[in-house]
């Protein structure tokens, strides 16, 4: 029994609803009472939510899933996961009993934005060039972790004398802290780009010391 | 009509090896399941190994028992499954049926004996 | 592993009269249990699956229940053909395994 599911992880924002698709083909005079569906956590077999006997046997996971009940007698198994947290990431597992088996197994990738980073100087007043200055970039709430790119005014990459700390919350999004020491030159440009690598979106911010 | 068809059966010496086939018409083999279970009057049915789909990189699993000895494989061009048995032992002695869980084949009888 | 057991290992019952046969889960196995009658000389014939769903030429005497580790398979009127060994299996996870089987003899 062929059941199939997007090859590309599924990625849902944390906060918003996602669904994870899986589909297989009945035989002609198929009817729900001859289905068994299961989804599970792929790596525990944690039962997530069920259908048998010709009934939604309902959640078993945080009251948070749900079937699509008038799309599956045309074979659509798919999985409505509400509300996705971080902690939802990982490999869901479609199995499905008609007389015989099938399953297959999709990927949920959970993702947050980045907020725009906020930059603060250590000192910051009488400042010269040829002075050692600080420069701490912090951006909240985002995941997975980010990279942290700096660059000056000319856009030359600045990677020596950087460190980066990502210390995650209860819900697990990352703050992400990143801290440059520099020698201050003529042109004192400096950008703070962090990066999510799932979204491939880019916050950045940059602050101009004259 | 599903018909499931296993050959390859006989007598072996113990450590020596052997491989069934069994070839499937009347649906859509490549959709399927696939597995070897045995039967004999001391373990009664014994569920051998199992090979899946395309679609699951045709994944295998085995019994602890064959671990290492049996290896399943399947052509989905010629709608056959095979299973391959490398050192066999006296226990590994019984009828070998190829099924898709649902559908079974009328098996062949594997002897190992000296 | 997943232990089916079936603790009734050989029954005799009347023509006519009412079969109960059952099969205990080691744990849940969500309704993944097939029900097979093998006779004879011969392979195993799918009779239930999904635990109560009867396959197609199936006579309608025979019905399956249960859930959770608990499952059954009744024979509402035992006929003369209905002598064979019936043995359930688990499909929920690897190795799939096999209950120990009941004879069904006529008394």
């Known amino acids: 029994l062929e059941v199939q599911v997007p090859e590309d992880p599924v990625v849902a924002l944390v906060g918003t609803d996602a669904t994870l698709c899986c589909s297989f083909s009945p035989e002609p005079g198929f009817s729900l009472a001859q289905l068994n569906l299961i989804w599970q956590l792929t790596d525990t077999k944690q039962l997530v939510h069920s259908f048998a006997e010709g009934q939604d046997q309902g959640s078993a996971y945080a009251n948070r899933t749900a079937l699509f009940p008038d799309l599956l007698a045309q074979g659509n198994a798919s999985l409505r996961l509400q509300r996705v947290r971080v902690a939802d990431e990982g490999s869901f597992t479609c199995f499905v009993s008609i007389r015989d088996f099938g399953s297959a197994a999709v990927s949920l990738q959970v993702a947050a934005p980045y907020s725009k980073p906020s930059m603060t100087l250590e000192p910051n007043k009488d400042l010269r060039p040829g002075d050692t200055v600080t420069i701490t970039c912090s951006s909240y709430q985002g995941y997975p972790e980010a990279e942290v790119f700096w660059q000056d005014g000319q856009g030359v990459p600045l990677t020596g004398n950087v460190t980066t700390s990502q210390m995650a919350n209860e819900q697990g999004l990352f703050d992400v802290h990143s801290i440059l020491r520099v020698v201050l030159g003529a042109n004192g440009t400096y950008s703070c780009l962090v990066r999510n690598p799932v979204l491939q979106q880019d916050a950045h911010s940059s602050v101009t010391i004259t | 009509e599903v018909q499931l068809e296993e050959s390859g059966g006989g007598l072996v010496q113990p450590g020596g090896s052997m491989k069934l086939s069994c070839v499937v018409s009347?649906?859509?083999?490549?959709?399927?399941?696939m597995n070897w279970v045995r039967q004999s009057p001391e373990k009664g049915l014994e569920w051998v190994a199992e090979?899946?789909?395309?679609?699951?990189?045709?994944?295998?699993h085995y019994a602890e028992s064959v671990k290492g000895r049996f290896t399943i494989s399947r052509d989905d061009s010629k709608s056959s499954v095979y299973l391959q048995m490398n050192n066999l032992r006296a226990e590994d002695t019984g009828i070998y049926y190829c099924?898709?869980?649902?559908?079974w084949g009328q098996g062949t009888l594997v002897s190992v004996s000296a | 592993d997943i232990v089916l057991t079936q603790t009734t290992a050989s029954l005799a019952a009347s023509v006519g009269e009412t079969v109960t046969i059952t099969c205990r889960a080691s744990?849940?196995?969500?309704?993944?249990l097939a029900w097979y009658q093998q006779k004879q000389g011969k392979s195993p014939q799918l009779l239930i699956y999904?635990?109560?769903s009867l396959e197609d030429g199936v006579p309608s005497r025979f019905s399956g229940s249960g859930s959770g580790t608990q499952y059954s398979m009744k024979i509402n009127s035992m006929q003369p053909e209905d002598t064979a060994t019936y043995f359930c299996?688990?499909?929920?996870?690897?190795?799939?395994?096999f209950g120990g089987g009941t004879k069904l003899e006529i008394k």
């Open positions: 999904n635990a109560n």
């Open positions: 299996k688990q499909g929920y996870d690897v190795p799939y395994t």
């Open positions: 099924n898709s869980h649902a559908d």
């Open positions: 090979i899946r789909l395309k679609s699951n990189n045709y994944a295998t």
């Open positions: 744990e849940n196995i969500y309704y993944t």
């Open positions: 009347g649906f859509t083999f490549r959709n399927y399941w």
